[in-house]
Amino acid sequence: MMTGTIETTGNISAEKGGSIILQCHLSSTTAQVTQVNWEQQDQLLAICNADLGWHISPSFKDRVAPGPGLGLTLQSLTVNDTGEYFCIYHTYPDGTYTGRIFLEVLESSVAEHGARFQIP
């Protein structure tokens, strides 16, 4: 039975040209995290595998930095980066946990962080 929950940074906003940290955290389970995949709609951003290290998709290589931890730093933001991002935790023996983050990239300088929330 899957008992864990994914806590994410929730709905967040950031300024065009700036950077943002996409972060998820798996709690309430003793399952071992073997890999975390980061995706945006139908595109893979990055993979962090416990044994194999990081894979960064070529389309994001210039502006994605691994970390901190299992998170992802997205740099040089454009309005096209607005949308849903998913952290997919592959664990043993539980299976897969998915967290969702919505990022809005703003033209103005009024970018505020949304509240943290949990996805069971």
Epitope: Q35, Q43, L44, G53, W54, I56, P66
Partner: antibody, heavy 115, light 106 residues
Framework: EVQLQQSGPELVKPGASLKISCKTS????????MHWVKQSHGKSLEWIGG????NGGTKFKGKATLTVDKSSSTAYMELRSLTSEDSAVYYC????????????WGQGTSVTVSS | DIVMTQSHKFMSTSVGDRVSITCKAS??????VVWYQQKPGQSPKLLIY??SYRYTGVDRFTGSGSGTDFTFTISSVQAEDLAVYYC?????????FGGGTKLEIK
């Protein structure tokens, strides 16, 4: 020039163990993950596992044990309790910096398990 | 484990033709797909990575797809393209390969 030079062909008896080497040159060994891939005669490819030299240590993947020697930029795969099912060509291959695609491959080591 | 299915074990084509090889994943693999070419008696060679990115010096080859369905295309087949072509996913370990498609030149 990047090179992955594997050890020569092997003929071993069932139940025996075997260690295959993959000596690398032309790049910084610790910056790339090393993988091992099996190809049985006339068959497809099967990924055995990979080892990140930076993390060092030993990786156990079924009957295979993957190790690295950073001082000689060499990767090793030991196969235990060999059976005829293990007769195959084994390749080492590296995956790139921040990329999982295996961009350079060794020439392969042919292993025959027969009594 | 994710199963990568290449429905055609063999494909026959002529020099100059355009040919497409398909690969279907048993579950979502996003764009974490690679294509390799293996000529008789040789090691596999990387052609396409991250589903659609050409590796150095492989101009006639293109890849496309996302999710579960992927296609590898040779725009104008040459005699030296006689080989087996494999798709492989690295979305999740264990990484898995398709069964291969052998390209035969008429």
């Amino acid at each position: 020039e990047v090179q992955l030079q594997q050890s020569g062909p092997e003929l071993v008896k069932p139940g025996a163990s075997l260690k295959i080497s993959c000596k690398t040159s032309g790049y910084t060994f610790t910056e790339y993950t090393m993988h091992w891939v099996k190809q049985s005669h006339g068959k497809s490819l099967e990924w055995i596992g990979g080892i990140n030299p930076n993390n060092g240590g030993t990786k156990f993947k079924g009957k295979a044990t993957l190790t690295v020697d950073k001082s000689s930029s060499t990767a090793y795969m030991e196969l235990r309790s060999l059976t005829s099912e293990d007769s195959a060509v084994y390749y080492c291959a590296r995956s790139g910096n921040w990329d999982y695609a295996m961009d350079y491959w060794g020439q392969g080591t042919s292993v025959t398990v027969s009594s | 484990d994710i199963v990568m299915t290449q429905s055609h074990k063999f494909m026959s084509t002529s020099v100059g033709d355009r040919v497409s090889i398909t690969c279907k994943a048993s579950q979502h693999v996003s764009t974490a797909v690679v294509w390799y070419q293996q000529k008789p008696g040789q090691s596999p060679k990387l052609l396409i990575y991250s589903a659609s990115y050409r590796y150095t010096g492989v101009d006639r080859f293109t890849g496309s797809g996302s999710g579960t369905d992927f296609t590898f295309t040779i725009s104008s087949v040459q005699a030296e393209d006689l080989a087996v072509y494999y798709c492989q996913q690295h979305y999740i370990t264990p990484w898995t390969f398709g069964g291969g498609t052998k390209l035969e030149i008429k």
